[in-house]
């Protein structure tokens, strides 16, 4: 569906399994027509999404889409949780679906768990 509204392409209930201590880039794919919107990241705390003001972010521009990136350098155990990006566009606030980061502590995992293990064995993860 073609639209000149801003659209944020994060899948509902998407997830990423990552190791504490590694660098990680969380991408918010943004489609817009003319002026690039102002985009921010927030982290869910219950039903509230707390804006991440002091975190390193950047833009990556590609031909048909742009990416607003939240940098984790490195990933910390308390980065575990759900994140959402939001765009301000013509005085409208557009919110993405949330995406969940499952952070595994390198100290408690002698080898990197598989994607299936990350999703199905929550005792490996910080929740």
């Amino acid at each position: 569906k073609e639209s000149c509204d801003v659209q944020l392409y994060i899948k509902r209930q998407s997830e990423h399994s990552i190791l504490a201590g590694d660098p990680f880039e969380l991408e918010c794919p943004v489609k817009y027509c003319a002026n690039r919107p102002h985009v921010t990241w927030c982290k869910l705390n219950g039903t509230t999404c707390v804006k991440l003001e002091d975190r390193q972010t950047s833009w990556k521009e590609e031909k048909n889409i742009s990416f607003f990136i939240l940098h984790f350098e490195p990933v910390l155990p308390n980065d575990n949780g759900s994140y959402r990006c939001s765009a301000n566009f013509q005085s409208n606030l557009i919110e993405s679906h949330s995406t969940t980061l499952y952070v595994t502590d390198v100290k408690s995992a002698s080898e990197r768990p598989s994607k299936d293990e990350m999703a199905s064995r929550p005792w490996l993860l910080y929740r």
Partner: antibody, heavy 119, light 112 residues
């Protein structure tokens, strides 16, 4: 429009492994979730599991967790289901389905493939 | 697992009459975005299921407007305002919020 085509054997022996493939057209599967559902003869629908083809992350129904494996091949634009340790109770129509991961624009089911577990 | 319970199991309706199918979930179906991911499927005899309604009340493209969905919390309803012969089918509600996804047991609609 989005279409799905399942393929696989119609007859599988008990204790064997079922392998089904689901080829998608009209959509790039990396922008979707693909999932598998089965329907035993004359009964209701049972969700088996799903994959995010963009990164390979899977979720399973615990009823199938130890026996089911869902995978995806982005280059072929298809998903697959493997179900092991089959018994007669696994006789069913197996459907693959695909939905838009972002905006709920579509949810499309394949035509289904009938699988009979029998020696 | 979330239990989805439909009622009735079957119903027979005269052509042009109204049909109502209920679906109750054992927990709230609100996702983290505050929306309830409750869908209705139609399965005609010998065919694969087809989504009719998503997010409780949104009609899929091409679905006649005699179909409507409503509800909130844990109680949802599918209504066919004027049943036609081609509506003979089994109707399923299912939740797309919690893992594992779960379906109602189905409601068989017949013409009286």
């Amino acid at each position: 429009q989005v279409q799905l085509q399942e393929s696989g054997p119609g007859l599988v022996k008990p204790s064997g492994t079922l392998s089904l493939t689901c080829a998608a057209s009209g959509v790039n599967i990396k922008d979707t979730y693909m999932y598998w559902v089965r329907q035993p003869p004359g009964k209701g629908l049972e969700w088996i599991g799903r994959i995010d083809p963009a990164n390979g992350y899977t979720r399973y129904n615990p009823s199938f967790k130890s026996r089911a494996t869902v995978s995806a091949d982005k280059s072929k634009n298809q998903a697959s289901l493997k179900l092991s340790s089959l018994t007669a109770a696994d006789t069913a129509v197996y459907y693959c389905a695909v939905n838009d991961g972002y905006f709920e624009y579509f949810d499309v089911w394949g035509q289904g493939t009938t699988v009979t577990v029998s020696s | 697992d979330i239990v989805m319970t439909q009622s009735p199991d079957s119903l027979a309706v005269s052509l042009g009459e109204r049909a109502t199918i209920n679906c109750k979930s054992s927990q709230s179906l609100l996702d983290s975005d505050g929306k309830p991911y409750l869908n209705w499927l139609q399965q005609k005899p010998g065919q694969s299921p087809k989504r009719l309604i998503y997010l409780v009340s949104k009609l899929d493209s091409g679905v006649p407007d005699r179909f409507s969905g409503s509800g909130s919390g844990t109680d949802f309803t599918l209504t066919i305002s004027s049943v036609q012969a081609e509506d003979v089918a089994v109707y399923y509600c299912w939740q797309d919020t919690h893992f594992p996804r779960t379906f109602g047991q189905g409601t068989k609609l017949e013409i009286k």
